[in-house]
C-alpha cells in the first residue's frame, strides 16, 4: 500500500539535492583558500539536520544554527552588496568588482542559491514531489527560513556604506515584502552602518526618469532615516554601460552619468 504523502503547492526538492550541495561546497572551498578548513561532509550533515524528519511548515532559525556555525565566514563589512529582484546583475557586478560580496558569494549563499528542499515529518526522506509554497502553504518552510536566517545575519554584519541594487522596472522598486524589505533593512545596525546607498537599475533604453523620486524609494528612505542611517540613491540608467565601466573604469565614456 503506498504511503500517504502531503501534497504541497510548491515545487519539490531540486533533483540530486544532496549531491549538488556537497559538490558546491567542495568547489567553493577549493576556490576560496580561507574556507579550505571546511569539512563539506559535516556541512551537508548540518544542512540535512536542519530539515530532515521535521514538519516542513515548522522549521525555525535555530534548526539552521549548526549549519550557520560551520559556514562561518568573515565578510569585509564595508563591501556588502544587497539586492532585490535583480539578482543576475548584482552577481555580474560582484564577479567583476571582486572585492564586493552579495550573500550568494558566501559559502552558505552559494550552497543554496536557486535550490529548493524539504523533508517530511518523522521520516528521513527528502520530498522530491512538492514543498510548501511561502504564500499558499506556510512561511516557516525550510527554504524561506534558511534565506531569512542567512539574510538577517548578512545584514547584521554590514558596516559603513551598504549598497543595495534595486530593479527600476518593477512596479514596486522597493518592496516591503521582499527579503530586503522585510529582513535586511531591519537588521542593518545603526551603530555600524552610516549610509544605505540604493542603486536603481533602469530597464528601458530611453528611460531618463529620476527613479530615486519613486514613492517606494521615498518609503525606503523614510524607514532607513527612522533607524538613524543616512540614505542616498543613484539612478543606473544604462546597466550594460555600468558593468562595462566597472570592468574598464579608465574608458573615456565612463566619466559621464551611467
Amino acid at each position: 500500500v503506498p504511503r500517504w504523502r502531503q501534497q504541497w503547492s510548491g515545487p519539490g526538492t531540486t533533483k540530486r539535492f544532496p549531491e549538488t550541495v556537497l559538490a558546491r561546497c567542495v568547489k567553493y572551498t577549493e576556490i576560496h583558500p580561507e574556507m579550505r578548513h571546511v569539512d563539506c561532509q559535516s556541512v551537508w550533515d548540518a544542512f540535512k539536520g536542519a530539515f530532515i524528519s521535521k514538519h516542513p511548515c515548522n522549521i525555525t532559525e535555530e534548526d539552521y544554527q549548526p549549519l550557520m556555525k560551520l559556514g562561518t565566514q568573515t565578510v569585509p563589512c564595508n563591501k556588502i552588496l544587497l539586492w532585490s529582484r535583480i539578482k543576475d546583475l548584482a552577481h555580474q557586478f560582484t564577479q567583476v568588482q571582486r572585492d564586493m560580496f552579495t550573500l550568494e558569494d558566501t559559502l552558505l549563499g552559494y550552497l543554496a542559491d536557486d535550490l529548493t528542499w524539504c523533508g517530511e515529518f518523522n521520516t528521513s526522506k527528502i520530498n522530491y514531489q512538492s514543498c510548501p509554497d511561502w504564500r499558499k502553504d506556510c512561511s516557516n518552510n525550510p527554504v524561506s527560513v534558511f534565506w531569512k536566517t542567512v539574510s538577517r545575519r548578512f545584514a547584521e554584519a554590514a558596516c559603513d556604506v551598504v549598497h543595495v541594487m534595486l530593479n527600476g522596472s518593477r512596479s514596486k522598486i522597493f518592496d516591503k515584502n521582499s527579503t530586503f524589505g522585510s529582513v535586511e533593512v531591519h537588521n542593518l545596525q545603526p551603530e555600524k552602518v552610516q549610509t544605505l546607498e540604493a542603486w536603481v537599475i533602469h530597464g528601458g533604453r530611453e528611460d531618463s526618469r529620476d527613479l530615486c523620486q519613486d514613492p517606494t524609494i521615498k518609503e525606503l528612505e523614510s524607514i532607513i532615516s527612522k533607524r538613524n542611517i543616512q540614505f542616498s540613491c543613484k539612478n543606473i540608467y544604462r546597466p550594460d554601460k555600468f558593468l562595462q565601466c566597472v570592468k574598464n573604469p579608465e574608458d573615456s565614456s565612463c566619466t559621464s552619468e551611467i
Partner: nanobody, 116 residues
C-alpha cells in the same frame, strides 16, 4: 579593536560557586552567538555553554543543571553562573563570540581551580 575580557575566575572548594563574566568591546554583542569554552591541561578545548543571539541556550552534558549562561545585551556582557563545582571543572575558561559573517572572537581566558 575587538576585545573580550573574562573575569570572575579563582580558587573555590568543591561544591562552591563562581560567576564568570565576559565584557565585550568593539562589537555589538546582541548580534553574536556567545559561548563559554574550557581547556584543562593536556585536554582539548571544549564547549561548556552557549547562548544564541535569539537567547536559546545549550550546555555540555557534564554541566547541565549546575551551570547557567545568560547575556545582557545592553551592558555588552555574557555571564556563566557555576554552581556545585567539582574538581573536574578545573580549567581555563574562555569567552567566545561567533557570528556567521561578522567574525569569531576569543577572550584571553580566566583560570578556575576547584580544590579543597
Amino acid at each position: 579593536q575587538v576585545q573580550l575580557q573574562e573575569s570572575g575566575g579563582g580558587l573555590v572548594q568543591p561544591g562552591g560557586s563562581l560567576r564568570l563574566s565576559c565584557a565585550a568591546s568593539g562589537i555589538i554583542l546582541r548580534i553574536y552567538d556567545m559561548g563559554w569554552y574550557r581547556q584543562a591541561p593536556g585536554k582539548q578545548r571544549e564547549l561548556v555553554a552557549a547562548i544564541t543571539s535569539g537567547g536559546r541556550t545549550n550546555y555540555a552534558d557534564s554541566v547541565k543543571g549546575r551551570f547557567t549562561i545568560s547575556r545582557d545585551n545592553a551592558e555588552n556582557t555574557v555571564s556563566l553562573q557555576m554552581n556545585s563545582l567539582k574538581s573536574g571543572d578545573t580549567a581555563v575558561y574562555y569567552c567566545n563570540a561567533d557570528h556567521t559573517f561578522a567574525g569569531v572572537y576569543w577572550g584571553q581566558g580566566t583560570q578556575v581551580t576547584v580544590s579543597s
